[in-house]
């Protein structure tokens, strides 16, 4: 695959992965309720997030509240929400680095410097990955934790939400797209043959004498 | 030994705040969930509040919420329950409880709490 | 809430005999993720805090005599103390941890 497929695909990747990770970000389903026993008859379900905590009625009727003070937040929830907006910026900055050094943009002149700037961008996306990786993973491990204690109430146990899936989904687009883009840049510096079209000269028009010029032939 | 000492305990006007603590000694505190749990007089036991091993989750009773605030020290090995706008049937016996799985296996000798104008 | 009921509230028996103290709950206990049944009794004495007897229903708690027995399943549960003896006499409750809030027994009062 030539590296311009390569880049095209993997900045695909990475903006549908950055969609994602925004979309996991903002919503309030990092953890539900854990209905354990057909003793807890409860006529709500809980959803928490990096944000807001919503109670969802057996009705369908949803009420979210934002919450007041980041003070009185648990430690995991603001370093989940500083590496997760982090990582969203980090990924904005990675889009305007890739395309800066794309192929098919004028922002830097062909050539080496055009690669390790494609190159460059790459890696922002994957160290946005991991970015966002390590939130969605030691929040992971509290809910499981948690899950599993004895000492924490029924009624108070929680399961993984939808947005730590969409979490992880989007950091594995993140990072096999950022792959890909350096992948695509490594292509640029050591087969520059793969990189941009090749060039061919128009042959020659035919002589008076009707004769074509022999260098025209391999 | 396991121990644990309540104080902060005494007399105190409706409407007003008292904090009381609990040193513990003889277990790794911060290995367990810890609780209060009060007693009127001539009355049952009943559960105030609980907390986890590091303080990041509480629990209350209906009757505190909103205005009692169990919270820990692990390094100075302390249990805490703010309590603010008490009330006269806030006047109890307040016992500092060991918690592991949800029940109560040691408990300190408890210190009065009496709301009174 | 899981409303505790306990009986009887108050109880005379003599030195050597058998007590039995019932407990209800409003709800099952048995909490089907570990398959136990949350409930504990404790004992306290006149003027002392309370001494935890028994928990998961029948598991008796380190140092406590084996006269002191714990069982039932579900809903309804019994103390059943085999033989009485003089430093036995004090209040017993039994107790919920199935979920919060957590939730005591009136208490059954013993006396010689």
């Known amino acids: 695959m030539g590296s311009a497929a390569l880049e095209i695909l993997g900045l695909v990747l990475c903006l549908v992965g950055w969609g994602g990770l925004i979309l996991a970000c903002g919503l309030p389903m990092w953890q539900v309720t854990a209905f354990l026993d057909h003793n807890i008859v409860t006529a709500q379900t809980t959803w928490k997030g990096l944000w807001m905590s919503c109670v969802v009625q057996s009705t369908g009727h949803m009420q979210c509240k934002v919450y007041d003070s980041v003070l009185a937040l648990s430690t995991e929830v603001q370093a989940a929400r500083a590496l997760t907006v982090g990582a969203v910026l980090l990924a904005f900055v990675a889009l305007f680095v890739t395309l800066a050094g794309a192929q098919c943009t004028t922002c830097v002149a062909p050539g080496p410097a055009k690669a390790r700037v494609a190159l460059t961008g790459g890696v922002l996306y994957l160290l946005c990955g991991l970015l966002a990786l390590v939130p969605l993973c030691w929040f992971a491990n509290i809910v499981v934790r948690e899950f599993y204690d004895p000492s924490v109430p029924v009624s108070q146990k929680y399961e993984l939400g939808a947005a730590l899936y969409i979490g992880w989904a989007a950091t594995a687009l993140l990072m096999v797209g950022g792959g890909l883009l350096c992948c695509g840049a490594w292509v640029c510096t050591s087969r520059p043959d793969l990189s941009f079209p090749v060039k061919y000269s128009a042959p020659r028009r035919p002589t008076a004498t009707g004769d074509y010029d022999k260098k025209n032939y391999v | 030994e396991v121990q644990l000492v309540e104080s902060g305990g005494g007399l105190v006007q409706p409407g007003r705040s008292m904090k009381l603590s609990c040193a513990v000694s003889?277990?790794?505190?911060?290995?367990?969930?810890m609780a209060w749990v009060r007693q009127a007089p001539k009355k049952g036991l009943e559960w105030v509040a609980s907390?986890?091993?590091?303080?990041?989750?509480?629990y209350y009773g209906d009757s505190v919420k909103g205005r009692f605030t169990i919270s820990r020290d692990n390094a100075k090995n302390t249990l805490y329950l703010q309590m603010n706008s008490l009330r006269s049937e806030d006047t109890a016996t307040y016992y500092c409880?060991?918690?592991?799985?949800?029940?109560?296996?040691?408990w300190g000798p408890g210190t009065m709490v009496t709301v009174s104008s | 809430d899981i409303v505790m009921t306990q009986s009887p509230s108050s109880l005379a028996v003599s030195a050597g005999e058998t007590v039995t103290i019932n407990c209800k709950s409003s709800?099952?206990?048995?909490?089907?993720?570990?398959?136990?049944?949350?409930l504990a009794w404790y004992q306290q004495k006149a003027g002392q805090s309370a001494k935890l007897l028994i928990y998961?229903?029948?598991t008796r708690e380190s140092g406590v005599p084996d006269r002191f027995i714990g069982s039932g399943s579900g809903a309804d549960f019994t103390l059943t103390i085999s033989s009485m003896q003089a430093e036995d006499r004090a209040t017993y409750y039994c107790?919920?941890?199935?979920?919060?809030?957590?939730?005591f027994g009136a208490g059954t009062k013993l006396e010689l």
């Open positions: 409880a060991r918690h592991p799985r949800r029940y109560f296996d040691f």
């Open positions: 003889g277990f790794t505190f911060s290995d367990y969930y």
């Open positions: 907390i986890s091993y590091e303080g990041r989750n509480t």
């Open positions: 709800q099952s206990l048995l909490f089907s993720g570990d398959q136990e049944n949350h």
């Open positions: 998961w229903a029948s």
């Open positions: 107790q919920q941890n199935y979920d919060i809030p957590y939730t």
